[in-house]
């Protein structure tokens, strides 16, 4: 069956400053790919997070992703600001050249809220 | 006080197409997402069918697909389903959901409105 | 789609006795589990969210616990007014949205 990519969450409130997590798991680790997470649709979207190698400032990985059986690729934003007010998606892509998205989660609406 | 109120269930032949509705009142109805729950008489509960608050996003059972409409009229805080081609199983008392507004679970639920199908 | 299988069908008690449901998932809902009262006439009503969460107004005799795929709604002394059919609801995976068949608690 096709891989799907669950966000549990329709929307997280977080005040400015403070850390949220947003969650995401994977119902298969099949096909091999990378998954990536965006705020935005489009081709406009950023990219928050990469589970590879990359560092990205104030963006965690909740579990270890690097663990074979690991299905959970939830992210945790720290001190987060107005402007990483949002929809974030997790998305899975298929390996390739280039890599090919194939599944994405519903989104999670990101408020942020004054101190 | 949130509340919801279903009408335009009714005996209708099989077939034939019917449309309910929901007013709602008591909360920002656009915020929120809405979804029509159904229950056969005697059995469970069935979802069939959600629309985001903004109308964006629709999704419905399998059962119903391609056969029932959902729509919404935020300017009236009210809530439709178009039901055509109606068969004996859809014969049901269809309830109004109102969503959490973070997870998809039902805060509010109207009283319902019986649906018969039956020729 | 989640299927959600809720036992017993039917749990025959007294007032005052406690009252242990299932809800068995067929795939991990970590923690994403409603639980609803409806009594014969009525509409459902909201429990128990967040498989241990009570919902406002729910009175501490009734608790949730539970997750993965094993859950349990316990009423730790039956009221006259307990005496209804529960049921389950998913909200992990997006829709389709699934409830469990349902247990009728009713009175011995």
């Known amino acids: 069956t096709e891989v799907k990519v669950i966000q549990p969450e329709k929307s997280v409130s977080v005040a400015a400053g403070d850390s949220t997590v947003l969650n995401c798991t994977l119902t298969s680790l099949l096909p091999v790919g990378p998954i990536r997470w965006y705020r935005g649709v489009g081709q406009s979207r950023q990219l928050i997070y990469s589970f590879t190698t990359e560092h990205f400032p104030r963006v965690t990985n909740v579990s270890d992703a690097t663990k074979r059986s690991n299905l959970d690729f939830s992210i945790r934003i720290s001190n987060v600001t107005p402007e990483d007010a949002g929809t974030y998606y997790c998305v899975k892509f298929q390996r390739g050249s280039p890599d090919t998205e194939i599944q994405s989660g519903g989104g999670t609406e990101v408020y942020v809220l004054a101190k | 006080e949130v509340q919801l109120v279903e009408s335009g269930g009714g005996v209708v032949q099989p077939g034939r197409s019917l449309r309910l509705s929901c007013a709602a009142s008591g909360f920002t109805f656009s915020s929120y997402d809405v979804n029509w729950v159904r229950q056969a008489p005697g059995k469970g509960l069935e979802w069939v069918s959600l629309?985001?608050?903004?109308?964006?996003?629709?999704y419905y059972a399998d059962s119903v697909k391609g056969r029932f409409t959902i729509s919404r009229d935020n300017s009236k805080n009210t809530l439709y389903l178009q039901m055509n081609s109606l068969r004996a199983e859809d014969t049901a008392v269809y309830y109004c959901?109102?969503?959490?507004?973070?997870?998809?679970?039902?805060?509010?639920w109207g009283q319902g409105t019986l649906v018969t199908v039956s020729s | 789609e989640i299927v959600l299988t809720q036992s017993p069908g039917t749990l025959t008690l007294s007032p005052g006795e406690r009252a242990t449901l299932s809800c068995r998932a067929s795939?991990?809902?970590?923690?994403?589990l409603a639980w609803y009262q409806q009594k014969p006439g009525q509409a459902p009503r909201l429990l128990i969210y967040g498989a241990s969460s009570r919902a406002t107004g729910i009175p501490d005799r009734f608790s949730g616990s539970g997750s993965g795929t094993e859950f349990t709604l316990t009423i730790s002394s039956l009221q006259s007014e307990d005496f209804a059919v529960y049921y389950c609801q998913q909200y992990y995976d997006r829709p389709p949205l699934t409830f469990g068949g349902g247990t009728k608690v009713e009175i011995k």
């Open positions: 959901a109102k969503e959490n507004n973070r997870y998809r679970f039902f805060d509010d």
């Open positions: 795939q991990s809902v970590y923690t994403y």
């Open positions: 629309i985001s608050g903004s109308g964006e996003i629709i």
